[in-house]
Interface confidence: medium
């Protein structure tokens, strides 16, 4: 039975040209995390695997940095970066946990961070 929950940074906003940290945290389970995938709609951004290490998708390598921890840092943001991001935790023996973050990239300086929320 999957008992864990994923806490994410929730709905967040950032300024065009700036950077943002996408962060998820898996709690309430003793399952071992074997891999974390970071995905954006129809693209893989990055993989962090215990054996492979970090792997950043080539189309993002110039503006995506691994970390902190299992998180991901997006740099040089554009309005096209607005959208859903998913952290997918592959665990043993529980299976897969997925967290969702919605990022809005704003033209002006009115960017504010949203509240954290949990996905069971």
């Amino acid at each position: 039975m999957m008992t864990g929950t994923i806490e994410t940074t929730g709905n967040i906003s950032a300024e065009k040209g700036g950077s943002i940290i996408l962060q998820c945290h898996l709690s309430s389970t003793t399952a071992q995390v074997t891999q974390v995938n970071w995905e954006q709609q129809d693209q893989l951004l990055a993989i962090c695997n215990a054996d492979l290490g970090w792997h950043i998708s080539p189309s993002f390598k110039d503006r995506v940095a691994p970390g902190p921890g299992l998180g991901l840092t997006l740099q040089s943001l554009t309005v096209n970066d607005t959208g859903e991001y998913f952290c997918i935790y592959h665990t043993y023996p529980d299976g897969t946990y997925t967290g969702r973050i919605f990022l809005e990239v704003l033209e002006s300086s009115v960017a504010e961070h949203g509240a954290r929320f949990q996905i069971p």
């Epitope: 693209q43 893989l44 492979l52 290490g53 998708s57 080539p58 998913f86 946990y97 997925t98």
Partner: antibody, heavy 120, light 113 residues
Framework: QVQLQQSGTELVRPGTSVKVSCKAS????????IEWVKQRPGQGLEWIGV????????IYNEKFKGKVTLTADKSSSTAYMQLSSLTSDDSAVYFC?????????????WGQGTLVTVSA | DIVMTQSPSSLSVSAGEKVTMSCKSS????????????LAWYQQKPGQPPKLLIY???TRESGVPDRFTGSGSGTDFTLTIGSVQAEDLAVYYC?????????FGSGTKLEIK
């Protein structure tokens, strides 16, 4: 254009080892994962494992642990698969493949295959 | 490991006919969090390496003719060839890329009458 050039046919004795090479060209070698797939004559496809040429880290199908060692040489943009303690069950065509932009299990670029025949 | 079961193992059709083949997985390949199915279809012609046709259960790879259609979700998937051409003679494999090891089905061999 992207190419994966594999080494030629190998005829080897039981109990020995063989090292199959996969030379990549047309792209930045460390930007993509390399997967290896086995196909016995007239049979289906078996996923052997994957290597991250950037870190040297690898993931293996449990079935091939102890049998296969995956390595990569960044200086020559070449991935290697070593098979040890060869038996007739290891006689097969071995393919290397570069992963697709979206998922690390998707292979649109393949080597031509290397036939390994184990015979006394 | 996730077991992929394909049926039929072979089929023989005339050019112009519609063909469907099935792939079933022993575990769901659907990630309910992002609503994606981690299933791919490959075509392997004699003497050649496999070629990626479909990923995400239903998205055609660039350059793949639109007569190839993937459908299904969870554990049941289908590859349909709308109007078979002579060049479609091949073995078709489905593949799990939801979790390691990335297992393949045993294949469906398509023969042209």
């Amino acid at each position: 254009q992207v190419q994966l050039q594999q080494s030629g046919t190998e005829l080897v004795r039981p109990g020995t080892s063989v090292k199959v090479s996969c030379k990549a060209s047309g792209y930045a070698f460390t930007d993509y994962l390399i997967e290896w797939v086995k196909q016995r004559p007239g049979q289906g496809l078996e996923w052997i494992g994957v290597i991250n040429p950037g870190s040297g880290g690898a993931i293996y199908n449990e079935k091939f642990k102890g049998k296969v060692t995956l390595t990569a040489d960044k200086s020559s943009s070449t991935a290697y698969m070593q098979l040890s303690s060869l038996t007739s069950d290891d006689s097969a065509v071995y393919f290397c493949a570069r992963y697709h932009y979206y998922g690390s299990g998707l292979f649109p670029y393949w080597g031509q295959g290397t036939l390994v025949t184990v015979s006394a | 490991d996730i077991v992929m079961t394909q049926s039929p193992s072979s089929l023989s059709v005339s050019a112009g006919e519609k063909v469907t083949m099935s792939c079933k997985s022993s575990q769901s390949l659907l990630n309910s969090g992002n609503q994606k199915n981690y299933l791919a279809w490959y075509q392997q012609k004699p003497g050649q390496p496999p070629k990626l046709l479909i990923y995400g259960a239903s998205t055609r790879e660039s350059g793949v003719p639109d007569r190839f259609t993937g459908s299904g979700s969870g554990t049941d998937f289908t590859l349909t060839i709308g109007s078979v051409q002579a060049e479609d003679l091949a073995v078709y494999y489905c593949q799990n890329y939801h979790s390691y090891p990335f297992t393949f089905g045993s294949g469906t061999k398509l023969e042209i009458k």
